[in-house]
Interface confidence: low
């Protein structure tokens, strides 16, 4: 009679994470009598997956009834597969011995590969804001996928980016993999409303890639432009000076008026107007009582934006042409904030 062979017909099996893997194994003979065991791996470190005679194997079920005398099907199902279950599984026949069972013959092995979806890509930008014309780096990370093959693309407002570098780790065999990519993006003044998108495509996603986004509003700082102008005289001894603060982002801004280098008033931008590109405009004005000045006045609008060093714009106010009113010691009329701001 021909000697028993242990046949594992599937060289490899591919299963999606969370599903059930069926590992097939048949024997060609009922002789010798003895149990089977399933192992993952070979050698001293091999892991027992199923033992016909003993133990608790809650994730494993047999395909056929192993208690039947004529059974030669030793296939098993392993439920709720995870990437950690990947490996080569061996069906091993034992011969009933005296006093103990001994290993008789092993199947050739079935390699179980697990398809696992990548995690949602997480995109992160630089820790500090940057101004237009500067290049900033964005990173994208996704983890836990298998097999290793994966495609990652970067987009800015729907336009594909080309300046990026991607690594998939680890380099060798692993139960699951991670991808890390860094893209370089040049900022423009119009990028407040822009988005950077990292797109990951993998066999497990069935053509529906995962996307992670970052808003450039979290990254960009658009510094303001300043313009100081003198308005027509509102009253005989008063001059209205305005400081137009244009095209800035984010909103955090503090303005200080200086008269001949001395602080006259400080205010914080609150109600601002928003431009179509997402930047803001703001205006502050100062009523100067020219009769309080004997000489020309240098008015300076000084703006500190988003914690950056102050920028300023000055305006020389000529007072010689205006009559001087004695007894007035107020150089600037410190009206309420709402009155000072023109929107």
């Amino acid at each position: 009679e021909e000697e028993l062979q242990v046949i594992q017909p599937d060289k490899s099996v591919l299963v999606a994470a969370g599903e059930t893997a069926t590992l097939r194994c048949t024997a060609t003979s009922l002789i010798p009598v003895g149990p089977i065991q399933w192992f993952r791996g070979a050698g001293p470190g091999r892991e027992l997956i199923y033992n016909q005679k003993e133990g608790h194997f809650p994730r494993v079920t047999t395909v056929s009834d192993l208690t039947k005398r004529n059974n030669m099907d030793f296939s098993i199902r392993i439920g709720n597969i995870t990437p950690a279950d990947a490996g080569t599984y061996y069906c091993v026949k034992f011969r009933k011995g005296s006093p103990d069972d001994v290993e008789f013959k092993s199947g050739a092995g079935t390699e179980l590969s697990v398809r696992a979806k990548p995690s949602a890509p997480v995109v992160s930008g630089p820790a500090a804001r940057a101004t237009p014309q500067h290049t900033v780096s964005f990173t994208c990370e996704s983890h836990g996928f298998s097999p290793r093959d994966i495609t990652l693309k970067w987009f800015k407002n729907g336009n594909e980016l080309s300046d990026f570098q991607t690594n998939v780790d680890p380099v060798g065999e692993s139960v699951s993999y991670s991808i890390h990519s860094t893209a370089k993006v040049v900022l423009t003044r119009e990028d407040v409303h822009s988005q950077v998108i990292c797109e990951v495509a993998h066999v497990t996603l069935q053509g529906d890639p995962l996307r992670g986004t970052a808003n450039l509003s979290e990254t960009i700082r658009v510094p303001p432009t300043l313009e100081v102008t003198q308005q027509p005289v509102r009253a005989e001894n008063q001059v209205n000076v305005t400081c137009q603060v244009r095209k800035f982002y984010p909103q955090r801004l503090q303005l200080t008026w200086l008269e001949n280098g001395n602080v006259s008033r400080t205010e914080t931008a609150s109600t601002v107007t928003e431009n179509k590109d997402g930047t803001y405009n703001w205006m502050s004005w100062l009523l100067v009582n020219v009769s309080a000045h004997r000489d020309d006045v240098k008015l300076t609008c000084q703006v500190e934006h988003d914690g950056q060093p102050a920028v300023s714009k000055s305006h020389d106010l000529k007072v010689s042409a205006h009559p001087k009113e004695q007894g007035s010691n107020t150089a600037a009329e410190n009206t309420g904030s709402n009155e000072r701001n023109i929107y």
Epitope: G45, K53, A84, D100
Partner: antibody, heavy 115, light 106 residues
């Protein structure tokens, strides 16, 4: 009812030998995977030996490999751990366990390796 | 070998309080196993295959986790739960235990 009773512990000098026994009852020893696990005086657990059902395989960690031997006498339904070239770091409580994972534990026997 | 790090090493809880302890593996493991040991007694299997309760273990015990991060939770602490808890892995040879978390009753 499954019961495991260890014996054979004691005081041994470094370099000495000792054989621990584990008497099993309530099941047939030969058909189960059995292990020895030790607990150090600092209460750390360390697996030291395993013998699979049918005595097919025996495994040991590097810390005891070549010095410890696990075996069983199925007629007596008893598991053994032969220990030689003992070191002070082998000191501890030795437990006999059944199955993988360790569903059943004995009460343990104490080994002290000291001059 | 895979090193299992348990935290905290010592903790205390009042009766009825929820308790969570963790076991971190130096490399990914397939499943985690948890044992309970009371003073003067042998360890006892509590949870096998990460989340399955061993026979006779109260349902207030639960296990969870994957990869390198696993945890054991007691939904409502009872006085009899004061013990040392050990995690263990069978995924990689040699099979190792964590250093233990000692849980005391307040």
């Amino acid at each position: 009812e499954v019961q495991l009773q260890e014996s054979g512990g004691g005081l041994v000098k470094p370099g000495g030998s000792l054989k621990l026994s584990c008497a099993a009852s309530g099941f047939t020893l030969s058909t189960y995977t059995m292990s020895w696990v030790r607990q150090t005086p600092e209460k750390r657990l360390e697996w030291v030996a395993i013998i699979t059902s049918g005595d097919t395989y025996t495994y040991y960690p590097d810390s005891v490999k070549g010095r410890f031997t696990i075996s069983r006498d199925n007629a007596k339904n008893t598991l053994y751990l032969q220990m030689s070239s003992l070191k002070s770091e082998d000191t501890g409580m030795y437990y006999c366990t059944r199955d993988r994972p360790l569903f059943h534990w004995g009460q343990g026997t104490t080994l002290t390796v000291s001059t | 070998q895979i090193v299992l790090t348990q935290s905290p090493a010592i903790m205390s809880a009042s009766p009825g309080e929820k308790v969570t302890m963790t076991c971190s593996a130096s490399s990914s493991v397939s499943y985690m196993y948890w044992y309970q040991q009371k003073p003067g007694s042998s360890p006892r299997l509590l949870i096998y295959d990460t989340s399955n309760l061993a026979s006779g273990v109260p349902v207030r015990f639960s296990g969870s986790g994957s990869g390198t991060s696993y945890s054991l939770t007691i939904s409502r602490m009872e006085a009899e739960d004061a013990a040392t808890y050990y995690c263990q892995q069978w995924s990689s040879f040699p099979w190792t235990f964590g250093g233990g978390t000692k849980l005391e009753i307040k």
